[in-house]
Interface confidence: low
C-alpha cells in the first residue's frame, strides 16, 4: 500500500482543486503552512484554510470530479480509490472560469473509539456555509484486507465497502467504521467521496492501522483530597478496555483571595500531588488521557471538578491509631483573608482541654503541629466516639475540628486443639474495644514451617480467616487442617476508612493447646472385701503425651458435693480411694490433660456410678428385745423376740435374712431361720435357754452377735 | 484606659426574661473573647459563658447552657446576655470580663458588675 | 469537672505576714491557673496567670508557684490594702471552673 495516504493521529486537511490549477493547498497538519515542518521532519498542526473567493457557486457544473491530495508535490498523481465512479481517475477537464480560482478543502479527524469497537472520522468544510443550499453527501469507502501480502498495490473494484456519513451539521460529518478487535492491528484502507450540487470530490487512499489512533475515553472518578502532609491530591482512574498505559495531562487552577495560579503536568500515574495548597481556595481541574508507548490521541477533558479548601486545613483531618501510640495534627489557619502566623496557633481538645504549649511545632510559618504521646483510649462523649481537635488563633477557635479515634486494640485470641488433632478453633471477643461505626474486623493470620518465635510479629505476608459470630458474643474461627509443629501467629486487624489497626500478635502452636478427648470406660466399683471405692478409665488415643488425670467423686444425687483426687502417674488407670459409706452409691468423673502442663482440661468423661453391694459379711447381728408370756408358775412360756432392720452401715450393705441360733442344756444347739422377718416367737421349757440373732448376707453370716439367755427364775418383762 | 460597663440587671420573676449589656472602651473590641461571670451573693465566682472576637464562636457552663445567650456587636462595641426561664439560683451580681487574648478565658479587665435579682 | 478547693477558708493575719493560700485541683491542670483578688462590692482583679506569671501593675510581693494539682499563692509581707478574698481559676479544662475563696482578715 505505498501508494496509500498513512493517516497520523492528528488532523490533516485535504485539498481538492479544480484541473490545471496549481496545488498550492495540500493537506498539511494542522498550523504549518506547505513548506514547514519541525525539526525531525515531520507536519503537526493543521493550516487554516484559505480562500480566493468565498461567495462561488457550482451553479454551472454537472458531475464533475475534483482531484483531491494530501500531498505537496505537485507533479505526482495521487494514489486511486479502485472504487471510484465508473473507475475514472480524479482529473477532469472543467471549462468553469470560475473553479480555476479556488480549492475546497476539509479538515479530517480519524480515530478508533475508547471502546475498541468504532473507527471514526469527521470531515469539516472548510467552505463554511458554501453546501448549505445543495445537497450535499459524504461517503467513506473502506476496506481490512484480509491478507496484505498477496493482496495489489490497489483493492481492486468492489472490495470496498460504504458508510453513509451522517452530516447533522453541514459542515462537520460523522464517519464510523465498525472494526472487528481482531483487526485492530490490521491496515485499514479507506477514501472519501463528497458529492454537492453534482460535483463530486473524492480523496486519495488513506491507511491507518486502528490500534494507533485510539482516542481514549476521559479518564474516570477524578477527585481531590488533602494528604496527611498537607497536599493536594488529584486522583481518577483510567478508562475501562484501553489495552496500553496512558499518559495523562492534567491541567488545574487554583484560585485564592491571595494567588490565581495554573498550571499543566504530563504525568503517567493516575494521580498528582500539589503542594503549597492554602485555606480558603478553590481548585479547579480536569484531566486527558493518550496512549503512553505509542501513537495516539487525546482523549477529551473530563468534566471540570472544584475542590474547595476550607479556612482552616486539618492534615490529616481524622487519625485512626491505638492506645498508646504517639501522633501527629498539623494545621493552617485562615482568618480573615490572612493567613494566622503559626505561632499564634493554640491547640485545644474537645473545646474543653487546652493542649499545652510543650505539645506545638511551628512546621513553618504558617503551619502549626501539635503531637499527642502514649495516647489513651478515646471514651466516647455522646454519640461521638473520638475527640475534637481544634486549631484556634489567639481570639477564637474555628468551628472545624480534626477527629481523633484511639482505640485498645489490646483483643485476647485463645486457641483450643480438638482431641482428634484435626482441627484448631480460636475464640476472640470484641466486648474489650471500643465500637467504631463502619469498621470491620478480621482475624488475620501467619503460618510458620515450624514453632513460634520468642517474639511474635506480624509478617507482611498474612492470610484473613473467616469468623462467626457465636450466641456467647465471641467470634469463632476455625483452622482446619492443622500442622500440629508449625506456629500461628494471629491478630485482629481493624479495617477502616481512615486506616486499619493490627491486635498485638499472638503466636499459637496447636500442639501446645490440645484439649483431649476424655478418659473413656470409666468404671466404679467398692471393692469387696477390702471396702474401697476403686475407679478405673482408658487414657483417649489422642494426644501421644503423657497426661495427668483428674477424678471426681461423691454421693450421686441432686447435687453431687464433688471431692477431688489427682493422678500424676501417666501410666496409671486405676485408682482405688477410700470412702466413708460403702454402701452409697458414688459418681465418678475423670478428665485428663497433657502432664507437662500445656493445653486444657478435657471435658470430664460421662459419670460412672457404683452400685451397692455386699462387701463384707454384716459387721454384727442386731440388737433385739424379748417379751414373755404365759403363767410366772408354769414352766413353759412363749418368748417373742425383737429387733430393728440392720442399717447399711452394718449389714454391709444387705441383709437376706435372720438366723436365731438356741443353745440349751437338754436339747443342745439348733438354728432356726426366720427370713427377713424381724420378730420371732419359741417356746422357753427348760432352766437356761440362749438365743443369738444373726443377720445373714450374700458374703455370710455377721460375727459379731449379742446373746440372750433366759433362767430360772424369771419374772415377766414389758 | 479599658472599661466595662453592665446594664440591664433588675428584679425578675422565675420564668422571666432578662437582657444584660456590656460597654466596652479603651480596646480594640472585635480583637478580644469577651465572658460572662456570676457571683451569687456571699458566694464564689462562677464562669458563665465566653464568646470569641468575631462572635463565631460561642460557649456555655452546663447550668445555663439553652437558656442563656451570649452574643455581641462589634460594630457598637458592646456583649450581650440574654437571660431565658430564669430560676432563683441564677440570681447574682453578673461581671462581664474581658479576656486577656489568648482563648484561655483568662479575664484581665472587670465591669463593676450588675445585680440580677430572680424572685416571686 | 474540675473541682478546685482553697485552703483555708478563712485566714487572719496581721501586716507584714506573710501569707500563703492552697489551691488543689481534682485533676491535673498543669500550670493553667490563675488567681484573683477580690474586695468587697468590686469586680475581680486578676493578679497572677499560668501558676507563677505576675499580671502588669500588680506588686512583686505576690508570688504563685505549683503545677499538676497544687498551687500555691503567697503574700510575702502582708499589707493593708491586701485584705481582700482571693480565687484560683483553672483554665485548662471546660467549665474553667473557679475556688470557693480564701478570705484574708485582719487579725
Known amino acids: 500500500f505505498n501508494l496509500s495516504y498513512p493517516i497520523t493521529p492528528w488532523r490533516f486537511k485535504l485539498s481538492c482543486m479544480p484541473p490545471n490549477s496549481t496545488y498550492d493547498y495540500f493537506l498539511l497538519p494542522a498550523g504549518l503552512s506547505k513548506n514547514t515542518s519541525n525539526s525531525n521532519g515531520h507536519y503537526e498542526t493543521a493550516v487554516e484554510p484559505k480562500f480566493n473567493s468565498s461567495g462561488t457557486h457550482f451553479s454551472n457544473l454537472s458531475k464533475t470530479t475534483f482531484h483531491c491530495c494530501f500531498r505537496s508535490e505537485q507533479d505526482r498523481n495521487c494514489s486511486l480509490c479502485a472504487d471510484n465512479i465508473e473507475g475514472k481517475t480524479f482529473v477532469s477537464t472543467v471549462n468553469s472560469l470560475v473553479f480555476q480560482q479556488i480549492d475546497a478543502n476539509w479538515n479530517i479527524q480519524c480515530w478508533l473509539k475508547g471502546d475498541l469497537k468504532l473507527f471514526i472520522c469527521y470531515v469539516e468544510s472548510l467552505f463554511k456555509n458554501l453546501f448549505r443550499n445543495y445537497n450535499y453527501k459524504v461517503h467513506l469507502l473502506y476496506v481490512l484486507p484480509e491478507v496484505l501480502e498477496d493482496s495489489p498495490l490497489v483493492p481492486q473494484k468492489g472490495s470496498f465497502q460504504m458508510v453513509h456519513c451522517n452530516c447533522s451539521v453541514h459542515e462537520c460529518c460523522e464517519c464510523l467504521v465498525p472494526v472487528p478487535t481482531a483487526k485492530l492491528n490490521d491496515t485499514l484502507l479507506m477514501c472519501l467521496k463528497i458529492t454537492s450540487g453534482g460535483v463530486i470530490f473524492q480523496s486519495p487512499l488513506m491507511s491507518v492501522q486502528p490500534i494507533n489512533m485510539v482516542k481514549p475515553d476521559p479518564p474516570l472518578g477524578l477527585h481531590m483530597e488533602i494528604t496527611d502532609d498537607g497536599n493536594l491530591k488529584i486522583s481518577w482512574s483510567s478508562p475501562p478496555l484501553v489495552p496500553f498505559p496512558l499518559q495523562y495531562q492534567v491541567k488545574y487552577s487554583e484560585n485564592s483571595t491571595t494567588v490565581i495560579r495554573e498550571a499543566d503536568k504530563i504525568v503517567s500515574a493516575t494521580s498528582l500531588l500539589v503542594d503549597s495548597i492554602l485555606p480558603g481556595s478553590s481548585y479547579e481541574v480536569q484531566v486527558r488521557g493518550k496512549r503512553l508507548d505509542g501513537p495516539g490521541i487525546w482523549s477529551d477533558w473530563s468534566t471540570p471538578r472544584v475542590f474547595t479548601t476550607q479556612d482552616v486545613i486539618y492534615f490529616p483531618p481524622k487519625i485512626l491509631t491505638s492506645v498508646g501510640s504517639n501522633v501527629s495534627f498539623h494545621c493552617i489557619y485562615k482568618k480573615e483573608n490572612k493567613i494566622v502566623p503559626s505561632k499564634e496557633i493554640v491547640w485545644w481538645m474537645n473545646l474543653a482541654e487546652k493542649i499545652p504549649q510543650s505539645q506545638y511545632d511551628v512546621v513553618s510559618d504558617h503551619v502549626s503541629k501539635v503531637t499527642f504521646f502514649n495516647l489513651n483510649e478515646t471514651k466516647p462523649r455522646g454519640k461521638f466516639t473520638y475527640d475534637a481537635v481544634y486549631c484556634c488563633n489567639e481570639h477564637e477557635c474555628h468551628h472545624r475540628y480534626a477527629e481523633l479515634y484511639v482505640i485498645d486494640v489490646n483483643i485476647n485470641i485463645s486457641c483450643e486443639t480438638d482431641g482428634y488433632l484435626t482441627k484448631m478453633t480460636c475464640r476472640w471477643s470484641t466486648s474489650t474495644i471500643q465500637s467504631l461505626a463502619e469498621s470491620t474486623l478480621q482475624l488475620r493470620y501467619h503460618r510458620s514451617s515450624l514453632y513460634c518465635s520468642d517474639i511474635p510479629s506480624i509478617h507482611p505476608i498474612s492470610e484473613p480467616k473467616d469468623c462467626y459470630l457465636q450466641s456467647d458474643g465471641f467470634y469463632e474461627c476455625i483452622f482446619q487442617p492443622i500442622f500440629l509443629l508449625s506456629g500461628y501467629t494471629m491478630w485482629i486487624r481493624i479495617n477502616h476508612s481512615l486506616g486499619s489497626l493490627d491486635s498485638p500478635p499472638t503466636c499459637v502452636l496447636p500442639d501446645s493447646v490440645v484439649k483431649p478427648l476424655p478418659p473413656s470406660s470409666v468404671k466404679a466399683e467398692i471393692t469387696i472385701n477390702i471396702g474401697l471405692l476403686k475407679i478405673s478409665w482408658e487414657k483417649p488415643v489422642f494426644p501421644e503425651n503423657n497426661l495427668q488425670f483428674q477424678i471426681r467423686y461423691g454421693l450421686s444425687g441432686k447435687e453431687v458435693q464433688w471431692k477431688m483426687y489427682e493422678v500424676y502417674d501417666a501410666k496409671s488407670k486405676s485408682v482405688s480411694l477410700p470412702v466413708p459409706d460403702l454402701c452409697a452409691v458414688y459418681a465418678v468423673q475423670v478428665r485428663c490433660k497433657r502432664l507437662d502442663g500445656l493445653g486444657y482440661w478435657s471435658n470430664w468423661s460421662n459419670p460412672a456410678y457404683t452400685v451397692v453391694m455386699d462387701i463384707k459379711v454384716p459387721m454384727r447381728g442386731p440388737e433385739f428385745w424379748r417379751i414373755i408370756n404365759g403363767d410366772t408358775m408354769k414352766k413353759e412360756k412363749n418368748v417373742t423376740l425383737l429387733w430393728k432392720p440392720l442399717m447399711k452401715n452394718d449389714s454391709l450393705c444387705s441383709v437376706q435374712r435372720y438366723v436365731i441360733n438356741h443353745h440349751t442344756s437338754c436339747n443342745g444347739t439348733w438354728s432356726e431361720d426366720v427370713g427377713n422377718h424381724t420378730k420371732f416367737t419359741f417356746l422357753w421349757t427348760e432352766q437356761a435357754h440362749t438365743v443369738t440373732v444373726l443377720a445373714i448376707n450374700s458374703i455370710g453370716a455377721s460375727v459379731a452377735n449379742f446373746n440372750l439367755t433366759f433362767s430360772w427364775p424369771m419374772s415377766k418383762v414389758n | 484606659e479599658v472599661q466595662l460597663l453592665e446594664s440591664g440587671g433588675g428584679l425578675v420573676q422565675p420564668g422571666g426574661s432578662l437582657r444584660l449589656s456590656c460597654a466596652a472602651s479603651?480596646?480594640?473590641?472585635?480583637?478580644?473573647?469577651m465572658s460572662w461571670v456570676r457571683q451569687a451573693p456571699g458566694k464564689g465566682l462562677e464562669w458563665v459563658s465566653a464568646i470569641s472576637g468575631s462572635g463565631g464562636s460561642t460557649y456555655s457552663a452546663d447550668s445555663v447552657r439553652g437558656r442563656f445567650t451570649i452574643s455581641r456587636d462589634n460594630s457598637k462595641n458592646t456583649l450581650y446576655l440574654q437571660m431565658n426561664s430564669l430560676r432563683a439560683e441564677d440570681t447574682a451580681v453578673y461581671y462581664c470580663?474581658?479576656?486577656?487574648?489568648?482563648?484561655?478565658?483568662?479575664?484581665?479587665?472587670w465591669g463593676q458588675g450588675t445585680l440580677v435579682t430572680v424572685s416571686s | 469537672d474540675i473541682q478546685m478547693t482553697q485552703s483555708p477558708s478563712f485566714l487572719s493575719a496581721s501586716v507584714g505576714d506573710r501569707v500563703t493560700i492552697t489551691c488543689r485541683a481534682s485533676q491535673g491542670i498543669s500550670s493553667s491557673l490563675a488567681w484573683y483578688q477580690q474586695k468587697p462590692g468590686k469586680a475581680p482583679k486578676l493578679l497572677i496567670y499560668t501558676a507563677s506569671t505576675l499580671q502588669s501593675g500588680v506588686p512583686s510581693r505576690f508570688s504563685g508557684s505549683g503545677s499538676g494539682t497544687e498551687f500555691t499563692l503567697t503574700i510575702s509581707s502582708l499589707q493593708p490594702e491586701d485584705f481582700a478574698t482571693y480565687y484560683c481559676?483553672?483554665?485548662?479544662?471546660?467549665?474553667?471552673?473557679f475556688g470557693q475563696g480564701t478570705k484574708v482578715e485582719i487579725k
Open positions: 481559676q483553672q483554665l485548662n479544662y471546660y467549665p474553667f471552673s
Open positions: 470580663a474581658k479576656d486577656q487574648g489568648d482563648w484561655d478565658f483568662l479575664f484581665d479587665y
Open positions: 479603651g480596646f480594640t473590641f472585635s480583637s478580644f473573647a
